[in-house]
Interface confidence: low
């Protein structure tokens, strides 16, 4: 969470941004809020990116002004126009690219004053893992797969019964480059598993952490998975 203040004559407004992460190839949001102003025509929103000459996006007089927009962002940005008057200056970014990572500034000017705040935007790829029982193996094993990760993550296994055990010797992890030559498919196999146990496959890079759990009993297999972005907020 970053809060910035600006001064315009005697007036300043608070602008707040949140560090966030974008998933390559998907749409992302750069979050920014400010003190509301009912005079829409007096609100100017400018998004800038460090190292880029030209604007990421500009909204003023109630509409987008993309005359100074950098080519990198052409056709890929939008503000939530109907929410500007209530203080939402967040930017929607289509088709997130690896090169979108960096430091952005959300600059606001209203009839009340002006202010700005920076945010760090990380880009990468992250996806939910899925664990299945691998019946093709000579011994009972589990296969954890996640389709898209970047940068290359670490993969670790854990077990509810053998807490603190190191499974690196009885697991094998591979990374297969996807067709776009950036992201990779993660596959990890855990051997010699026992029934009536819950196993977790944890995939983590500097952007996200994902965990897949599988509970194997004589009668059923239960699965769950979760994903959280790191250093966000």
């Amino acid at each position: 969470l970053i809060i910035g203040f600006g001064i315009s004559g005697k007036h300043f407004i608070t602008v707040t941004t949140f560090t966030s992460a974008g998933n390559i190839g998907e749409d992302g949001t750069l979050s920014c809020t400010f003190e509301p102003d009912i005079k829409l025509n007096g609100i100017v929103i400018q998004w800038l990116k460090e190292g880029i000459k030209g604007l990421v996006h500009e909204f003023k007089e109630g509409k987008d002004d993309l005359s100074q927009q950098h080519e990198m962002f052409r056709g890929r940005t939008a503000v939530f126009a109907d929410q500007v008057v209530v203080g939402n200056a967040s930017l929607r970014l289509k088709n997130v690219q690896l090169t979108d990572a960096g430091t952005y500034t959300c600059y606001i000017r209203t009839s009340k004053g002006k202010g700005n705040a920076n945010l760090e935007y990380k880009t990468g790829a992250f996806s939910m893992p899925e664990i299945n029982v691998d019946y093709n193996a000579s011994s009972e094993s589990l296969r954890c797969e996640a389709p898209r990760w970047f940068p290359q993550p670490t993969v670790a296994w854990a077990s509810q019964v053998d807490q603190g055990a190191n499974f690196s010797e009885v697991s094998n992890t591979s990374f297969e480059l996807n067709s776009e030559n950036v992201t990779m498919k993660v596959v990890s196999v855990l051997y010699n598993v026992t029934i009536n146990n819950t196993y977790s496959c944890m995939i983590e890079n500097d952007i996200a952490k994902a965990t897949g759990d599988i509970k194997v009993t004589d009668s059923e297999v239960k699965r769950r998975s979760q994903l959280q972005l790191l250093n966000s907020g």
Epitope: G51, K53, H70, E71, T99
Partner: antibody, heavy 119, light 108 residues
């Protein structure tokens, strides 16, 4: 096919103003930064500065006080002026196009103009 | 400004040999903004590699780029007669844009 063609005076006396123009044929003028680079005889490359279609300029701090880069978008041309030249400004001057965001490199260059400063 | 130091200054090799050219930055440069050029006498430079490792259009695959942070490398896997020239690295991670001093690859 994008082509950059440049012209201007090749022989100057010390204290005069160097003036070069570069015309852009093919491609969009508005999507790039248009750049001047120079290379003294037998030496390396030095970035002078750049301009985009809206007139935004960026100059090398070492030359900033003497350099003006301007553009005439209606003609797809941009120009370099370097005032108060000395023998140290003798170089081949190139115009070039700084390519888009995914590239940040000079894909297209002019043919180069040798500018000699001599009394 | 970011200073790019290229080494060696001159590389004497025979056709068919492998050439490894180095470029070191005085501070970290995002690989997005690192490029390599080839220049032959009387000609303008020609871009070979951009984004530290991506070959420009029409560049043979014997040319490859690698590196990150402050250390970047241009490799010519097997020198052809037409590859003997001067090579420059260039950054625009921060202004001003700067070039390295160049490495001359000459015939041994």
């Amino acid at each position: 096919q994008v082509q950059l063609q440049q012209w201007g005076a090749g022989l100057l006396k010390p204290s005069e103003t160097l003036s070069l123009t570069c015309a852009v044929y093919g491609g969009s003028f508005s999507d790039y930064f248009w750049t001047w680079i120079r290379q003294p005889p037998g030496k390396g490359l030095e970035w002078i500065g750049e301009i985009n279609h809206s007139g935004t300029t960026n100059y090398n701090p070492s030359l900033k006080s003497r350099v003006t880069i301007s553009a005439d978008t209606s003609k797809n041309q941009f120009s370099l002026r370097l005032s108060s030249v000395t023998a140290a400004d003798t170089a081949v001057y190139y115009c070039a196009r700084l390519s888009s965001w995914s590239n940040w490199a000079f894909e297209y260059w002019g043919q180069g103009t040798l500018v000699t400063v001599s009394s | 400004e970011i200073v790019l130091t290229q080494f060696p200054g001159t590389l004497s090799l025979s056709p068919g040999e492998r050439a490894t050219l180095s470029c070191r930055a005085s501070q970290s440069v995002s690989s997005t903004y690192l490029a390599w050029y080839q220049q032959k006498p009387g000609q303008a430079p020609r871009v070979l590699i951009y984004g530290a490792s991506r070959r420009a259009t029409g560049i043979p695959d014997r040319f490859s780029g690698s590196g990150s942070g402050t250390d970047f490398t241009l490799t010519i896997s097997r020198l052809e007669p037409e590859d003997f020239a001067v090579y420059y690295c260039q950054q625009y991670g921060s202004s001003p844009l700067t070039f390295g001093g160049g490495t001359k690859v000459e015939i041994k």
